[in-house]
Interface confidence: low
């Protein structure tokens, strides 16, 4: 008769290294009488006998993981118990080794010069792979702009044209190396004018060539504007070399003009634009023809887009250095001030301000702006915005709110031409024509003041200020 013997583990478990999808085996040799019951745990959780990912053989002494996954790593223990003495335990670690794998490869990137580019390269592997990058055929050197981040991603600060090219990331550990596909980093450069057209003073009927050179990636297109409109006459010759576009506009000069070269290129959904302008003046051009203070052009802004008539020509005042931008800024500022006014006043005030700042324009030898008709101005002032106007005038007269940022460019109604004197000399506000049907107290459409000589332009504007602290309601 054999004597009972408490279990003794004769081959303690050891650390097992295994590759993903390979087999891993733990041996737990036990001596005892009677034969012990052997159970296995992973990270202190019992492994079920019927779990098909494992095979338990040799009376439970052999545990085999049939196809190792990276989630299988952990501490495996065998526990032997035969009722004699206490249970005994031996533990060992499974270290899942894995060849490098690129889980998030880099993708093609288009980036604007000067911005920051990040090319991702997320990896898996055990031991943890080291990540390096190749540009073209050479290993990429890190510097103060270019760095491989902890995650493996490549970060390039202040991207330069020279950074364009083909990149791939390389993940390496003791078990192997993984390469990403080649990806392309394209560096886009805002359009920039290298050579601006020069101004000319010529005799009537002579030919002039204006030249404009621009650079950018992609290569910009160049368009020419004459007094705010697309050039209607003249011939354009263009050549492109090494991302530089050279455009020459040849003109037959019969009137003076402001010619603007506009270089544009596209970056995704957005465009970048560079402008340069030159004047062509005619020697001994008569005084009356010199009096024009601006040009006619289509409105290309955003603020008044819904208010102004589609495709209408409006007047841009060349006393501003950049008329279109300056007038848009003025209306933008005014628009913000109008956020506080009543729902009745606001649309009427918007129509008034847009049509006052962007007056209808009659092109011709001397572009002529057309002011708003006096009656429409008075309708806004005395009906739609009466309360706001009174409050505003009261504040202005007491010397309050002189801050230039909060000035509203409001026309002085009394100085505007009457539609009854000459209906073609002033602009109607369609918004008010449409609204007046619904308003019974519409002011009389004759001026409340004695008729006077009506100047062609508002001689001045009175600017009233609305402080953000003061609500026009």
């Amino acid at each position: 008769e054999k004597l009972p013997k408490a279990p003794v583990i004769t081959t303690p478990l050891e650390t097992v290294d295994a590759l993903v999808e390979e087999v891993a085996t733990f041996m737990c040799a036990v001596e005892s009488y009677p034969q012990p019951e052997i159970s296995w745990t992973r990270n202190k959780i019992l492994i079920k006998l019927f779990d098909t990912r494992y095979s338990i053989r040799e009376n439970g002494q052999l545990l085999t993981i049939l196809s190792v996954e990276d989630s299988d790593d952990g501490i495996y223990c065998c526990i032997a118990n035969n009722g004699v003495g206490g249970a005994v335990e031996s533990c060992g670690a499974l270290q899942v080794k894995m060849k490098p794998k690129i889980t998030r490869p880099p993708i093609n990137v288009k980036i604007i010069e000067g911005l920051k580019a990040v090319l991702p390269c997320t990896t898996m592997g055990n031991p943890k792979p080291s990540v390096s990058w190749i540009k073209g055929d050479n290993a990429l050197r890190e510097n103060s702009r270019i760095a491989v981040l902890e995650s493996g991603s490549l970060r390039i600060h202040n991207v330069q044209k020279e950074d364009a090219g083909q990149y791939r990331c390389v993940a390496k550990n003791s078990l192997g190396t993984a390469y990403s596909k080649l990806v392309k980093l394209e560096v886009e450069v805002f359009a920039r004018i290298l050579r601006a057209p020069e101004s000319h003073n010529v005799t009537f009927g002579s030919f002039v060539t204006l030249r404009c050179t621009a650079i950018g990636i992609p290569v910009p297109t160049i368009s020419w504007i004459e007094n705010g409109n697309a050039v209607s006459s003249g011939s354009i010759q263009e050549s492109v070399k090494d991302r530089v576009i050279d455009s020459r506009l040849q003109l037959f000069i019969t009137k003076p003009g402001l010619y603007t070269c506009i270089a544009t290129n596209k970056h995704g959904e957005k465009f970048s634009t560079a402008k340069a302008a030159a004047t062509v003046s005619i020697a001994e051009w008569s005084k009356s023809q010199k009096d024009s203070q601006g040009y006619c052009a289509q409105y290309r802004g955003e603020v008044c887009d819904a208010v102004l008539a589609k495709d209408a020509l409006v007047f841009f005042n060349t006393s501003y250095r950049d008329p279109e931008d300056a007038q848009e800024l003025l209306i933008h500022t005014a628009w913000n001030e109008l956020k506080a006014v009543s729902p009745l006043c606001r649309p009427a005030a918007e129509a008034l301000l847009c049509n006052h700042l962007f007056q209808e324009c009659s092109p011709g030898v001397v572009p002529t702006p057309m002011p708003i008709c006096r009656e429409y101005c008075l309708a806004v002032k005395e009906l739609f915005c009466a309360k706001e106007w009174q409050a505003m005038e009261g504040k202005a007269h007491r010397g309050l709110y002189r801050s230039g940022m909060h000035l509203l460019p409001v026309p002085e109604c009394s100085k505007l031409p009457s539609m009854h004197r000459d209906p073609t000399a002033c602009t109607r506000l369609p918004y008010l024509d449409y609204k007046k049907e619904n308003i019974t107290t519409f002011p009389s459409i004759t001026s409340s003041r004695p008729s006077a000589d009506i100047p062609n332009l508002p001689a001045s504007t009175s600017s009233f200020a609305v402080s953000p602290a003061y609500s026009m309601t």
Epitope: G114, L115, E150
Partner: antibody
């Protein structure tokens, strides 16, 4: 979390070389710029230079001829050497991490006082 | 190098009152990516500096919301809406646009 600790002699003789080491604990030294900044007693802060974990450096032009920085990624340390020191180099020397997500020094050491005197 | 100029150099404040520090740079710190490369730091007595505001107006983590940064280009302001006793120290602005990074002379905030 990441902590920085400066170490080195507190007293250096004129014309000798000042050597300081900054040890990064609680995180990796990888993928950041590591910077040295100094502050003479009662005065403002002066940026000395920076080193990236790859070893690339940028120095303040006013000190460039005398400064050398190095990095030991295996020890999670970076160091500063300033040669031919004079009394004007007496200051508290700080090491700091430059976080280029925020373009700012987000972690600083507590500083070490270095006196240049014979 | 970009020169940073702070004012005032000394700022006595009553607890609970607001405080404002100005910082001016010798050239614009507005990058064409839209960020202003200006940071604010506070050095409390006997301590190393700590980051308050980065990129002009972003509060660093753990910084109370009574601190705010504003400005663009060459003129920047650090505001403390209600000064507390723990806010005493020297405040520095720093430009992060160019190497070498340069700091302002510092503004010493004291409690009245």
């Amino acid at each position: 979390q990441v902590q920085l600790q400066e170490s080195g002699p507190g007293l250096v003789k004129p014309s000798e070389t000042l050597s300081l080491t900054c040890t990064v604990s609680g995180g990796s030294i990888s993928s950041y710029y590591w910077t040295w900044i100094r502050q003479p007693a009662g005065k403002g802060l002066e940026w000395i230079g920076r080193i990236y974990t790859s070893g690339s450096t940028d120095y303040n032009p006013s000190l460039k001829s005398r400064v050398t920085m190095s990095v030991d990624t295996s020890k999670n340390q970076f160091s500063l050497k300033l040669s031919s020191v004079t009394a004007a180099d007496t200051a508290v020397y700080y090491c700091a991490r430059y976080n280029w997500n925020d373009d700012a020094f987000d972690i600083w050491g507590q500083g070490t006082m270095v006196t240049v005197s014979s | 190098d970009i020169v940073m100029t702070q004012s005032p150099l000394s700022l006595p404040v009553t607890p609970g009152e607001p405080a404002s520090i100005s910082c001016r740079s010798s050239q614009s710190l507005l990058h064409r990516n839209g960020y202003n490369y200006l940071d604010w730091y506070l050095q409390k007595p006997g301590q190393s500096p700590q980051l308050l505001i980065y990129l002009g107006s972003n509060r660093a983590s753990g910084v109370p919301d009574r601190f705010s940064g504003s400005g663009s280009g060459t003129d920047f302001t650090l505001k403390i809406s209600r000064v507390e006793a723990e806010d005493v120290g020297i405040y520095y602005c720093m430009q992060a646009l160019q190497i070498p990074h340069t700091f302002g002379q510092g503004t010493k905030l004291e409690i009245k």
